[in-house]
Interface confidence: low
């Protein structure tokens, strides 16, 4: 392949270079020079849940050649490069995003991050962005959706009119119910008995730590929280844990109940201002053996 001067001729090449300043290719924002810009807003924050996947975006604006961008995590006054972590580029019409992937988010991912770009031997650093990670107990032990669906639990959904009194009333009713039907226990079919025992045993074997999660969006607090770019909203999750009564013997009647744990938003108390709590749901199972 012929070189550029050979194709253009020396005179034509001169005019190309002469015209370059008048072309708008150096401009990124009108009169501003075409420097790389990293659009992470100062004081930006993300509240995320441990166990979830998360993508941390570094919006990058460049003109011709895409710069080499890296992520680092702040540790005191130094920023430790995250070279072994999965990253990717997302290209859009006017801006590109250099993404740091969390698959999934771990509790120790809590902290401040910064992206930096090498551009024409200059190092350009972004503002830092902070991840607030809310830890969820036994996030790795959650049953799959299929597993949850296959469990033949009879759930009586009770209106959340008052947590503890309702629970006590439910337990009392169940106790009376069990007492009333104690004489008729032998009349239960083998199949039903086996099925319910199986559920009870399955629950015990897993220490009954099943969790379901639901997403809800919470508005940013009215103090000066930045970007929350994007952002401007963060995801808060509520975990529900299923418990069995550990004091019951294997083949005795038992109660399994579920209660919702409302997760408190992490270290930044400012974020909790506009959170509306969802009603607590209680479900009970009358287990007969």
């Amino acid at each position: 392949m012929k070189t550029l001067p050979a194709m253009l001729g020396t005179g034509k090449l001169f005019w190309v270079f002469f015209l370059i300043p008048y072309l708008d290719i150096w401009n990124i924002h009108g009169k501003e020079s075409c420097d790389v810009q990293l659009y992470i807003k100062r004081q930006s924050e993300h509240s995320i849940l441990a166990g979830d996947p998360f993508e941390l975006e570094c919006p990058v604006k460049y003109c011709a050649n895409r710069p080499h961008v890296t992520w680092c995590k702040l540790n005191g006054t130094t920023c430790v490069k995250l070279e072994d972590r999965q990253t990717s580029w997302k290209e859009e019409k006017n801006i590109s995003f250099f993404i740091l992937h969390f698959e999934p988010v771990l509790p120790n991912d809590n902290g401040s991050y910064r992206c930096s770009a090498n551009f024409q031997s200059n190092l350009i650093e972004s503002h830092s962005t902070t991840l607030y990670v809310t830890d969820v107990k036994s996030a790795s032990e959650r049953p799959s959706k299929d597993e949850m669906a296959s469990r033949p639990w009879l759930l009586y959904r009770l209106l959340p009119l008052g947590g503890l009194p309702l629970l006590i009333t439910t337990c009392f009713c169940l106790f009376c119910c069990l007492r009333r039907h104690q004489g008729k226990q032998n009349e239960l079919s083998d199949t039903a008995g086996r099925e319910i025992n199986l559920v009870d045993a399955h629950l015990k074997s897993e220490q009954t730590e099943a969790s379901t999660r639901q997403n809800s969006q919470v508005l940013l607090s009215e103090t000066g929280i930045y970007d929350n770019d994007p952002d401007l909203c963060f995801r808060m999750q509520e975990g529900s844990e299923v418990y069995s009564n550990p004091c019951l013997e294997e083949n005795k009647p038992g109660i399994v109940y579920a209660s919702l744990n409302h997760s408190v938003i992490g270290p930044n108390s400012r974020l909790a201002r506009n959170v509306k709590e969802a009603p607590t749901e209680y479900a009970s199972i009358c287990v007969r053996s």
Epitope: H29, G30, D35, V36, Q37, L38, Y39, K41, R42, P59, K61, E92, K93, N94, I95, I124, E125, S126, H127, E222, T223, G224, I225, Y226, D227, N228, D229, P230, D231, L232, C233
Partner: antibody
Framework: EVQLQESGPSLVKPSQTLSLTCSVT????????WNWIRKFPGNKLEYMGY???????YYNPSLKSRISITRDTSKNQYYLQLNSVTTEDTATYYC??????????????WGQGTSVTVSS | DVQITQSPSYLAASPGETISINCRAS??????LAWYQEKPGKTNKLLIY???TLQSGIPSRFSGSGSGTDFTLTISSLEPEDFAMYYC?????????FGGGTKLEIK
């Protein structure tokens, strides 16, 4: 050069909705933050809110129940809607770009402003 | 909200003089204060951001200083085109707030 131009009715009746458009040239509204500010008679300036490159918004709490900022990226325009206006909303309305990056952050480009009178 | 008190609200000076305009925040805003110039029929011009950084294209006779709660805009050797309205604005936390303005007039 980045230019912003406000447009909309100069007279709005009380209890009606004030609707303004900011047309942007020289930059894309899919980068940066795009703001609305107003100046009351007597020169008091009030920050109203922003629309970000991603489409997220922030509204001044004093206006939260009445304000909406939206955009049309194909036209490179963003909009202000202020519901249930009163004579207190009589002001000059400005749109401005908030530029932020590795080097600096500030509202570096403003529109000329459009004067809106709320009167019956 | 952060309250910004700007003083004086009116200032008369002659070309060649040096003047100062002050802004005080109701609480610390770190270094995040910007200064703007407003002229009739023109768009607002950013002069200073982050307390002391001169915006590109602004003459060096404009300077900003201060951090925390107290900030000053100084214009040395006033030029005829400097007579205008000046505002300060904190950009440390939302909602951003402005000073009441200073009208700089020719004496």
């Amino acid at each position: 050069e980045v230019q912003l131009q406000e447009s909309g009715p100069s007279l709005v009746k009380p209890s009606q909705t004030l609707s303004l458009t900011c047309s942007v040239t020289g930059d894309s509204i899919t980068s940066g933050y795009w703001n609305w500010i107003r100046k009351f008679p007597g020169n008091k300036l009030e920050y109203m809110g922003y629309l970000s490159y991603s489409g997220s918004t922030y509204y001044n709490p004093s206006l939260k129940s009445r304000i909406s900022i939206t955009r049309d990226t194909s036209k490179n325009q963003y909009y202000l809607q202020l519901n249930s206006v009163t004579t207190e909303d009589t002001a000059t309305y400005y749109c401005a770009r908030y530029f932020y990056g590795s080097y600096y952050e500030a509202m570096d480009y403003w529109g000329q402003g459009t004067s809106v009178t709320v009167s019956s | 909200d952060v309250q910004i008190t700007q003083s004086p609200s009116y200032l008369a000076a002659s070309p060649g003089e040096t003047i100062s305009i002050n802004c005080r925040a109701s609480k610390s805003i770190s270094k995040y204060l910007a200064w703007y110039q407003e002229k009739p029929g023109k768009t607002n011009k950013l002069l200073i951001y982050s307390g002391s950084t001169l915006q590109s294209g602004i003459p060096s006779r404009f300077s900003g200083s201060g951090s925390g709660t107290d900030f000053t805009l100084t214009i040395s050797s006033l030029e005829p085109e400097d007579f205008a309205m000046y505002y300060c604005q904190q950009h440390n936390e939302y909602p951003w707030t402005f000073g009441g303005g200073t009208k700089l007039e020719i004496k």
